[in-house]
Interface confidence: low
């Protein structure tokens, strides 16, 4: 099941309990928790800009901040995918592009970022208060999702610093994310705890105002984007979405698929039975949507007598049922 | 965009056979797991088969095993259903469809326009 | 086989009001990944089906906000907030969990 996931803003224990101890002494042990706590959680920042230019045109960009590798992201509109929003763009770092009206234009910006315009014209251009969600699966974190609007008070051509915006999701957080060297610290400040725990408290008064130990991240977000983390799901203002996008296209259906070239010549092998994966061959690992790893082909057990269709461990259409990509 | 164009209606005689085409465009077959629906008049949709991943092959539904082959044509794009020892009750619009929303699994969201076949002695 | 069951069989509706059309299937559709496998697929007179819904909430791409599917396990419903007259039409839901995919038996929606 969906967890949420929110990065605690850690806080030194209270003055005065467990033998209180003077701030500078504690400076290492909450670094290093810091570092336990927040290791392997990463963190999805999303941007939302209106274009000088253009006043209906909008441009998302959203990263991802951690160390797994990409498989795959999902932009969407009017909330989280798979939560009432509508799907915009997905991009795939082998498979391409593909995107939907009112999305022109999708691309990779770096390795771990993306960006989307869209254009606004009719019934499907998107609006201020519309809501934007960027969702990123990763190998070893899992799924994390997060979403962002237009500030309210922008003018064109500005926009909100790139933020963990309100929904910051983890299916899997940071499934083997700590590093020995990081478990070693773990294990350590443990020891100086311990050490602590076992030592009589000082008789000096501690600072009432001992600093917070900072995010040991080089990419901590700034005090505004860390207050952002604690929001839960954002109340999403759906009033400016279109009412409906088949004034785009009256048949309804993908009609705005766009695509770039694909690589897959062949027919990779994928998971389940009438599942798919983006993956090339078996053996490799893949991204999950809700919580679960497996390996390529790697079939989930019968469920009666039929096969275990697209309910591949690694989630929904990391294997695609009778119906998708091979 | 993606479409799925499939060959004409057909009239067949009890006992004969049947192949239906489904020209894809916008998207390349093999990258696709094609699926094969039917409905005959006034009933329901009824899946028949499609393509495994897992195994590089086509499954078929019990009830038409030994009776339909699915087969694929990469070079052109096309997917073909074939239907043997046609029966009355196989008179129905005969669909291909397949998802390529997104890289997870959403649906079935594309599909042909719908070949009648016709079994009348 | 899943055998899926929908109620009822036929809904007559008014443009403007709500509509709500229920699915059951016999078993569950909740996958362990949280997933529930569940579409649902409108398919209007002489047209081919198309996809609403996928994954028991997922609203498909071009599909319009009016429509929303909840439910898990068994008990899936799809609604309409407000029926538009272009909503008519036969309405199905059908399991992606096993092979093979099975629908219900479809509801039919017109307008009164």
């Known amino acids: 099941m969906r967890t949420e996931a929110q990065v605690p803003a850690l806080q030194p224990p209270e003055p005065g309990l467990e033998g209180a101890m003077g701030h500078r002494t504690l400076v290492l042990p909450w670094v290093l928790l810091t570092l336990c706590v927040t290791a392997g959680t990463p963190e999805v920042w999303v941007q939302v800009r209106m274009e000088a230019t253009e006043l209906s045109s909008f441009t998302i960009r959203c990263g991802f901040l951690g160390s797994g590798s990409i498989s795959l992201v999902t932009v969407s509109w009017g909330g989280p995918n798979g939560a009432g929003g509508t799907t915009l763009a997905v991009l795939h770092p082998e498979r391409g592009i593909r995107q939907w009206a009112p999305a022109r234009q999708a691309r990779w910006e770096t390795q771990s970022s993306i960006s989307l315009i869209l254009e606004g014209s009719g019934a499907s251009s998107p609006c201020a208060n519309t809501t934007f969600c960027c969702k990123f699966a990763s190998f070893p974190e899992g799924s994390w999702e997060a979403c962002g609007s237009l500030p309210p008070s922008s003018d064109p051509g500005l926009s909100a610093p790139p933020t963990p915006a309100p929904i910051l999701r983890a299916d899997l957080a940071g499934i083997l994310g700590v590093s020995g060297v990081l478990l070693f610290g773990c294990v350590y400040l443990l020891h100086l705890l311990r050490r602590h725990k076992h030592r009589p408290a000082p008789r000096l008064q501690p600072s009432r105002t001992s600093p917070q130990a900072p995010r040991a991240r080089a990419w901590a977000p700034s005090q505004a984007s860390q207050a952002a983390l604690h929001v839960p799901y954002a109340t999403i203002n759906t009033s400016c979405r279109p009412a409906t996008l088949d004034t785009a296209h009256p048949h309804g259906g993908p009609s705005w698929w766009a695509s770039l070239p694909t690589h897959a010549a062949h027919r990779p092998q994928g998971p389940a039975a009438w599942a798919s994966t983006p993956i090339p061959a078996r053996g490799s690992f893949v991204s999950v949507e809700n919580g679960l790893y497996a390996q390529a082909g790697e079939r989930p057990p019968h469920t009666g007598p039929g096969l275990t269709l697209f309910p591949d461990p690694r989630g929904p259409r990391a294997m695609e049922g009778p119906l998708g990509v091979r | 965009e993606v479409q799925l164009v499939q060959s004409g209606a057909e009239v067949k005689k009890p006992g004969a056979s049947v192949k239906v085409s489904c020209k894809v465009s916008g998207y390349t077959l093999t990258e696709l797991s094609m699926h094969w629906v039917r409905q005959a008049p006034g009933k329901g949709l009824e899946w028949m088969g499609g393509?495994?991943?897992?195994?590089?092959?086509?499954i078929y539904a019990q009830k038409f095993q030994g009776r339909v082959t699915m087969t694929e044509d990469t070079s052109t794009d096309t997917a073909y259903m074939e239907l043997s020892s046609l029966r009355s009750e196989d008179t129905a619009v005969y669909y291909c469809?397949?998802?390529?929303?997104?890289?997870?699994?959403?649906?079935?969201?594309?599909w042909g326009q719908g070949t009648t076949v016709t079994v009348s002695s | 086989d899943v055998v899926m069951t929908q109620s009822p069989l036929s809904l007559p509706v008014t443009p403007g009001e709500p509509a709500s059309i229920s699915c059951r299937s016999s078993?569950?559709?909740?996958?362990?990944?949280?997933?529930?496998?569940l579409d649902w697929y409108l398919q209007k007179p002489g047209q081919s089906p198309r996809l609403l819904i996928s994954?028991?909430?997922n609203r498909a791409s071009g599909v319009p906000d009016r429509f929303s599917g909840s439910g898990s396990g068994t008990d899936f419903t799809l609604k309409i907030s407000r029926v538009e007259a272009e909503d008519v039409g036969i309405y199905y839901c059908m399991q992606a969990l096993q092979t093979p995919p099975t629908f219900g038996q479809g509801t039919k929606v017109e307008i009164k």
């Open positions: 469809a397949t998802g390529v929303t997104t890289y997870y699994y959403y649906g079935m969201d594309v």
């Open positions: 994954l028991g909430s």
């Open positions: 393509f495994d991943p897992e195994d590089g092959e086509t």
């Open positions: 078993q569950s559709l909740l996958y362990s990944n949280g997933n529930n496998f």
